[in-house]
């Protein structure tokens, strides 16, 4: 018995179906086919779980969280024992193993391994201003999304005709910050943060209004 090489890893957007491949060759009839799918969740590597089981011509549910979401892609028994997972969740991310036995065919590689990563687009980021908006001050524009896998990168841009930040600005795309030094009237305006990763984009807006000093009345 020989389980074929798997593609290594699969990426899928949260909520979308995933197909985890596992095929094998055997010299024996499929009368005694036994297939166990296991997962080692990324979130809990010490606690492997059973996903689905095929034994004695019957299918059995694995862990409760997979109930109603998992099944074999084809009619069993077959040499293609790939499974689907519907409505993928973040907690489905992990390393999946298919263990195949088909007596009396013994020997060879009877395990296939596939990684599954469930991707999450950036959630609507939160935009805020840190620091005084008085003319001549330094301000920091902050942007962060609570969710996003892979981790989002952040790009700030100014929504005026030039489509760019003022020359006194420096930005950190990883942290989602922009520091604008020595703000002036030219720094005022609408700023947009674009949070993006491999599967999505989300934005927030911030209105920076630089405050000019009020003329003081003398006497």
């Amino acid at each position: 018995l020989e389980v074929s090489e798997s593609p290594g890893s699969i990426q899928v957007a949260r909520g979308q179906p995933a197909v985890l491949p596992c095929t094998f060759t055997t010299s024996a009839a499929l009368i005694n086919l036994n297939v166990i799918w296991m997962v080692t969740p990324l979130s809990n590597a010490n606690q492997p779980e059973q996903v689905i089981l095929y034994q004695g011509g019957q299918m059995f549910d694995g862990a409760p969280r997979f109930h109603g979401r998992v099944g074999f892609t084809g009619t069993m028994p077959a040499t293609n024992v790939s499974i689907f997972i519907n409505n993928t969740q973040l907690s489905d991310t992990g390393t999946y193993q298919c263990l195949v036995n088909n007596l009396p065919d013994i020997g060879g590689r009877n395990i296939g391994v596939t990684g599954l990563t469930v991707l999450v687009p950036p959630s609507a980021p939160h935009c805020q201003i840190q620091g005084s908006q008085d003319i001549g001050s330094d301000v920091i524009l902050l942007c962060s999304s609570e969710e996003g896998i892979p981790r989002p990168t952040y790009l700030w841009e100014k929504l005026d005709n030039t489509l760019k930040l003022p020359p006194t600005a420096t930005q950190d795309q990883v942290q989602g910050t922009v520091t604008i030094r020595n703000i002036s009237a030219l720094s005022s305006g609408l700023y947009q943060c674009v949070a993006s990763n491999a599967i999505g984009t989300s934005t927030c807006l911030l209105d920076l209004q630089v405050i000019s000093p009020q003329p003081r009345n003398i006497g």
Partner: antibody
């Protein structure tokens, strides 16, 4: 080396399509606004389109609006111009240009060598 | 025709001074910054002036820029043969969110 390199130009029939690419190197592409500028044979410069850092915001000249689409892939440091429903008057050298981060106003401080687009039957 | 008006051509002798005007309106030059470009025959344009009057590094101080109201001016002193080229102004318009070049001026060094 800091440079912009355009490609994708050529001869196309009226009504046809072309996709221009501009490969950037030597600077932080994702933190730079980018534009396409064209020059018809013997004529002056004409700004075509601009894209913000992320490509989320885009501007177009009236002459190409609805026919051309600017986009960028920051992971590949590349700017694109998808040109559809091409007309004879779109015949020009197309330049990719970087907008200076040192300027408040629009200021193209780095240009590609240009790629020729000829629309003719 | 461009919304920014430049003289089609200007000429002067070597060593002389020349100015090139760029005339617009309140919706473009009047409320926005102007940049200037030099284009030698068969080459890509080169930035000479940005933000009305600033020079990028490497641009000699023979080149200067200014803006007054709805017009901008490029000045070139100590004219040299290699200054013979086409010159363009550029700004943007607030209304249409578009960038706009002037029609260009051909400088001939006599």
């Amino acid at each position: 080396e800091v440079q912009l390199l355009e490609s994708g130009g050529g001869l196309v029939q009226p009504g046809g399509s072309l996709r221009l690419s501009c490969a950037a190197s030597g600077f932080t592409f994702s933190q730079t606004a980018m534009s396409w500028v064209r020059q018809a044979p013997g004529k002056g410069l004409e700004w075509v389109s601009a894209a913000s850092y992320s490509g989320y915001s885009t501007y177009y000249a009236d002459s190409v609006k609805g026919r051309f689409t600017i986009s960028r892939d920051n992971s590949k440091n590349t700017l694109y111009l998808q040109m559809n429903s091409l007309r004879a008057e779109d015949t020009a050298v197309y330049y990719c240009a970087r907008d200076s981060r040192d300027a408040y106003g629009v200021a193209f401080d780095l240009w590609g060598q240009g790629t020729m687009v000829t629309v003719s039957s | 025709a461009s919304v920014l008006t430049q003289p089609p051509s200007v000429s002067a002798a070597p060593g002389q001074k020349v100015t090139i005007s760029c005339s617009g309106s309140s919706s473009n030059i009047g409320n926005n910054y102007v940049s200037w470009y030099q284009q030698l025959p068969g080459t890509a344009p080169k930035l000479l002036i940005y933000d009305n009057n600033k020079r990028p590094s490497g641009i000699p101080d023979r080149f200067s820029g200014s803006k007054s109201g709805t017009s901008a001016t490029l000045g070139i002193t100590g004219l040299q043969a290699e200054d013979e080229a086409d010159y363009y102004c550029l700004t943007w318009t607030g209304a249409g969110r578009i960038f706009v070049f002037g029609g260009g001026t051909k400088l001939t060094v006599l």
